[in-house]
């Protein structure tokens, strides 16, 4: 690919180093941390982005889950192992040989174990619920306007096919965006819902991953939509396997 050939930058990922060292002297952008060449015409995988961001501060979240099998990323940042496609390896381990299994968005889905822990396959996260609370406004947003604006955002900014935005719910001040994408639905070239959700999460936090673009300026009919809290729930195609001890804690 040629990534912004003129000045050799990666519009979709600022956590890259770009150089005219690709085939034929073309611009080639490699993700920090992993060194993998990325396709700058689409989103970079969450695994490569987390690897690039490994030195960032830890983020811990522990809020109520909407269903017994939904996962929240309580473990925060870690330096992940990515496969040659840039996806999370099913088993992740830290420097002290503590290992655990993750889903396709890199969230832990088992208890932690040792190096003998087996994670047979990378389980796909097929349903993501993004739960937002917006700052107080003069009145509630019009639901259909809000729905249209958020669908436009995911389509245009994150290049996510509209069919994967299953629903947008709104009960002031709570907005819920449901993303659904089964393995069978995801075609080659489709943006992964996990990657789109991660870019959205970083945008909402004012930590945009896009090169040189302004931060996210969300407006519904000209009215700014300012988010004061975000929670993301992940549902896997196969329920997670935690011990009863954790579930009752």
């Amino acid at each position: 690919h040629t990534a912004a050939q003129d000045n050799c930058t990666c519009p979709t990922n600022k956590m890259t180093v770009c150089s005219p060292d690709g085939p034929g002297g073309r611009c080639q952008c490699r993700a920090l941390g992993s060194g993998m060449a990325v396709d700058c015409s689409t989103l970079t995988s969450k695994c490569l982005l987390l690897k690039a961001r490994m030195s960032a501060p830890k983020n811990a979240r522990t809020l109520v889950r909407p269903s017994e099998h939904a996962l929240v990323d309580n473990d925060g940042l870690y330096d992940p192992d990515c496969d040659p496609e840039g996806r999370f390896k099913a088993r992740q381990c830290n420097q002290t040989s503590v290992c655990w299994c993750v889903n396709s968005v890199g969230v832990r889905r088992t208890d932690k174990g040792d190096l003998s822990l087996r994670c047979d396959e990378l389980v796909r996260t097929h349903h993501i619920l993004i739960d937002l609370r917006h700052r107080p406004t003069a009145g509630a947003f019009n639901h259909s306007d809000l729905d249209a604006e958020l669908r436009r955002l995911f389509r245009e900014r994150y290049r996510l096919h509209p069919k994967f935005v299953a629903a947008v719910h709104y009960e002031q001040p709570t907005i819920q965006i449901e993303l659904r994408q089964n393995t069978s639905q995801k075609a080659a070239g489709d943006v992964d819902i996990g990657d789109a959700a991660y870019y959205f999460e970083r945008d909402i936090k004012g930590e945009s991953l896009f090169q040189g673009r302004g931060g996210l300026d969300l407006r519904v009919r000209g009215e700014p939509l300012q988010v004061e809290r975000t929670l993301i729930y992940y549902l896997d195609e196969i329920p997670p396997k935690f011990s009863m001890k954790r579930l009752t804690a």
């Epitope: 690919h1 050799c8 180093v17 150089s19 005219p20 060292d21 690709g22 085939p23 034929g24 002297g25 080639q28 490699r30 920090l32 941390g33 992993s34 060194g35 993998m36 060449a37 990325v38 396709d39 689409t42 990515c82 496969d83 040659p84 496609e85 840039g86």
Partner: antibody, heavy 116, light 113 residues
Framework: QVQLVQSGPEVKKPGASVKVSCKAS????????LGWVKQAPGQGLEWIGN????????NYNEKFKGRVTITADTSTSTAYMELSSLRSEDTAVYFC?????????WGQGTLVTVSS | DIVMTQSPDSLAVSLGERATINCKSS????????????LAWYQQKPGQPPKLLIY???TRESGVPDRFSGSGSGTDFTLTISSLQAEDVAVYYC?????????FGQGTKLEIK
């Protein structure tokens, strides 16, 4: 034309440090990755790490982490590889190389001998 | 780390004959984003730095004779010298530059039979 010229051979005692230089010319030093490769006598090639001089991003092979430091001086278009706490198994030829899909440019190599 | 395994370790071929060196990687070197295989082949003669022959698994570096060709994708790659010349006697290495740390095969020593 692109050239990478390395510093001369070094003989060091165990426990000492060595700093090998690699002066680049014939291209824009700051916009290409520059890597370092080790070749022990009669052995194969081993990637030590690399640097992107324009932004000083550096990557190290875990095997060498802690003992190797890669730096670059953009004012002189020179990259450096410093190896500390030298031991006999560090005796090798060290190469610098411009990296990339079609960047077949290597320095001539610097022999570092560690001997008491 | 990606492990690169070459076969054979050494090879003796008659002048004018075909020489084939294989390289197998422990993980795929095919980048799905740009459909490029991050695999290079180098030739090294005694006392010299390695010389790039092939990059992207199959693209010949400029100035490299066309008797050298590379093929393969994913995890299995081959370097072929269609008609061996005396000056081709050297050690040949495959290298992955897909993910850090970049890794090399152990080398294949090519001699004349």
């Amino acid at each position: 034309q692109v050239q990478l010229v390395q510093s001369g051979p070094e003989v060091k005692k165990p426990g000492a440090s060595v700093k090998v230089s690699c002066k680049a010319s014939g291209y824009t030093f700051t916009i290409y990755w520059l890597g370092w490769v080790k070749q022990a006598p009669g052995q194969g090639l081993e990637w030590i790490g690399n640097i992107f001089p324009g932004s000083a991003y550096i990557n190290y092979n875990e095997k060498f982490k802690g003992r190797v430091t890669i730096t670059a001086d953009t004012s002189t278009s020179t990259a450096y590889m410093e190896l500390s706490s030298l031991r006999s198994e560090d005796t090798a030829v060290y190469f610098c190389a411009r990296e990339g899909s079609n960047s077949g440019y290597w320095g001539q190599g610097t022999l570092v001998t560690v001997s008491s | 780390d990606i492990v690169m395994t070459q076969s054979p370790d050494s090879l003796a071929v008659s002048l004018g004959e075909r020489a084939t060196i294989n390289c197998k990687s422990s993980q795929s070197l095919l980048n799905s984003g740009n459909q490029q295989n991050y695999l290079a082949w180098y030739q090294q003669k005694p006392g010299q730095p390695p010389k790039l022959l092939i990059y992207g698994a199959s693209t010949r570096e400029s100035g490299v004779p066309d008797r050298f060709s590379g093929s393969g994708s994913g995890t299995d790659f081959t370097l072929t010298i269609s008609s061996l010349q005396a000056e081709d006697v050297a050690v040949y290495y495959c290298q992955s530059d897909h993910i850090y740390p970049y890794t090399f095969g152990q080398g294949t020593k090519l001699e004349i039979k």
